[in-house]
């Protein structure tokens, strides 16, 4: 029950996170004009990954796309790439995790397959979240660098009389959305990985002796397994995730990826 809840919560948290990453990537407010020196500006500038906008006090907003690839800063391109990779990985992770959900029955999919898929989606969410956090952090670092550079030459005198104010940019709402969304996706991924470990049914760890009617053959099996007494639940459809130990009915089953997590 706790595993299902953990898996379900991980899925929901990741879903919210990825939606946030998509929203942040599409948002225009990655950087917004710093109003410290001119709080009563009638023209407000803000920029996104894909276009820059100007909002006038009149209410009129004009946005212009960056219709060039080669002319854009390498850092901006890197941020775009990180965010897109994050979205793609997150989307695939969501798709995989839907089929991995314990509450959803798909044919005769075994728990081991679901555990595998849960782990895969968890790792994807973790990488997706890290991509988003990295992308947003790179952009934020770029902003901080540019902010102090423009502060250094904020006012350039012209004839001693006229001053040209250089527009400075500070953190926009999209950065905070991106950080939070990346964090949520990361947390969701971790929850999926945790859920994966407990996705297999709880097995009683007996280090036991198997007594048979003949009284001759004594089977001692090291490691976690169910004593093969013939009593208890049918083990035919159960797999034990304990570093490769197998029930007698499952001689041909092989350890999965997540055995080593």
């Amino acid at each position: 029950m706790a595993v299902t809840a953990c898996q379900g919560l991980g899925f929901v948290v990741s879903l919210i996170g990825i939606a946030g990453i998509i929203a942040a990537t599409c948002m225009d407010q990655w950087s917004t004009q710093d109003l410290y020196n001119n709080p009563v500006t009638a023209v407000f500038n803000y920029q996104g990954l894909w276009r820059s906008c100007v909002r006038e006090s009149s209410g009129f907003t004009e946005c212009r796309g960056y219709f060039t690839l080669l002319g854009l800063p390498a850092m901006l391109q890197a941020v775009r790439a990180l965010m897109i990779v994050g979205i793609v990985l997150g989307a695939i992770g969501l798709l995989v995790s839907i089929f991995a959900l314990k509450c959803i029955r798909i044919g005769s999919m075994e728990d081991s397959a679901k555990a595998n898929m849960t782990l895969t989606s968890g790792i994807m969410f973790i990488v997706s979240g890290l991509c988003a956090i990295a992308g947003v952090s790179v952009f934020a670092n770029m902003l901080v660098t540019n902010f102090w550079m423009s502060t250094a030459n904020m006012y350039t005198g012209m004839g001693g009389m006229v001053q040209t104010v250089q527009t400075r940019y500070t953190f926009g709402a999209a950065l905070f959305v991106g950080w939070v969304a990346g964090g949520l996706t990361l947390i969701g991924g971790v929850m999926m990985c945790i859920a994966c470990r407990g996705l297999a049914p709880e097995e009683t760890n007996y280090k036991a002796v198997s007594y048979h009617a003949s009284g001759h053959s004594v089977a001692y099996k090291p490691g976690g397994f169910k004593a093969s007494t013939g009593f208890g639940s049918n083990t035919k459809n159960k797999k034990i995730y304990d570093g490769g130990a197998r029930t007698e009915d499952e001689v041909q089953s092989y350890p999965s990826k997540h055995d080593y997590v």
Epitope: A42, V43, E56, S58, G59, F60, V162, Q163
Partner: antibody
Framework: DVQLVESGGGLVQPGGSLRLSCAAS????????MHWVRQAPGKGLEWVAF????????YYADSVKGRFSISRDNAKNTLFLQMNSLRAEDTAVYYC???????????WGQGTLVTVSS | DVVMTQSPDSLAVSLGERATINCKSS????????????LTWYQQKPGQPPKLLIY???TRESGVPDRFSGSGSGTDFTLTISSLQAEDVAVYYC?????????FGQGTKLEIK
């Protein structure tokens, strides 16, 4: 056709109050920021106050700050200017103007004269 | 506050001749975000409210004759009437529309010589 009609002007004593109105028609009033601009007799134009379309943003000229108050009623398509503690230097023709792209004033009313005199 | 200074205060030009009015701002009115200059020109005839001529320093308002043109960038701007007509007699104002307060120039009175 866009129309802006000011009213409420008149003669008032120094220290007195007056409330100007600007009735708008011919456009979606609630979508536009509005301004009050004044012009003293024989003088140039002086910007007085601004109110955004939803009344979220309001700015005043330093000369009227604390004495004048701009407001609007979008349901009645009307702009207001409440003028308190009036001084002789507030004597002017008061215009309301519509804010358009480029932060320009594309339509102006005919103006209403406010005379502050004892 | 941005101080707007117009020159000359008054100007007399013959009909059909070119009239040029200058406007200088104490701060740059060029917005880096869209590379537009936030300067507006108005025409005011006696007994009438002002009329919008040009915004963004060089964009003519619809209905304004093409003999009116605006130019300049940053802090120095010019309004040019290529061929003066009798109906162009008026006072012309430039206005800072970049930051509040939205200050006006003192005005330039244009007359026929």
């Amino acid at each position: 056709d866009v129309q802006l009609v000011e009213s409420g002007g008149g003669l008032v004593q120094p220290g007195g109050s007056l409330r100007l109105s600007c009735a708008a028609s011919g456009f979606t009033f609630s979508s536009f920021g509005m301004h009050w601009v004044r012009q003293a007799p024989g003088k140039g134009l002086e910007w007085v106050a601004f109110i955004s379309s939803g009344s979220h943003t309001i700015y005043y000229a330093d000369s009227v700050k604390g004495r004048f108050s701009i407001s609007r009623d979008n349901a009645k398509n009307t702009l207001f200017l409440q003028m308190n503690s009036l001084r002789a230097e507030d004597t002017a023709v008061y215009y309301c103007a519509r804010f358009q792209y480029g932060n320009s004033f594309d339509y102006w009313g005919q103006g209403t004269l406010v005379t502050v005199s004892s | 506050d941005v101080v707007m200074t117009q020159s000359p205060d008054s100007l007399a030009v013959s009909l059909g001749e070119r009239a040029t009015i200058n406007c200088k701002s104490s701060q740059s009115l060029l917005n880096s975000g869209n590379q537009k200059n936030y300067l507006t020109w108005y025409q005011q005839k006696p007994g009438q409210p002002p009329k919008l001529l040009i915004y963004w320093a060089s964009t003519r308002e619809s209905g304004v004759p093409d003999r009116f043109s605006g130019s300049g960038s940053g802090t120095d701007f010019t309004l040019t009437i290529s061929s003066l007509q009798a109906e162009d007699v008026a006072v012309y104002y430039c206005q800072n529309t970049y930051s509040f307060p939205l200050t006006f120039g003192q005005g330039t009175k244009l007359e026929i010589k």
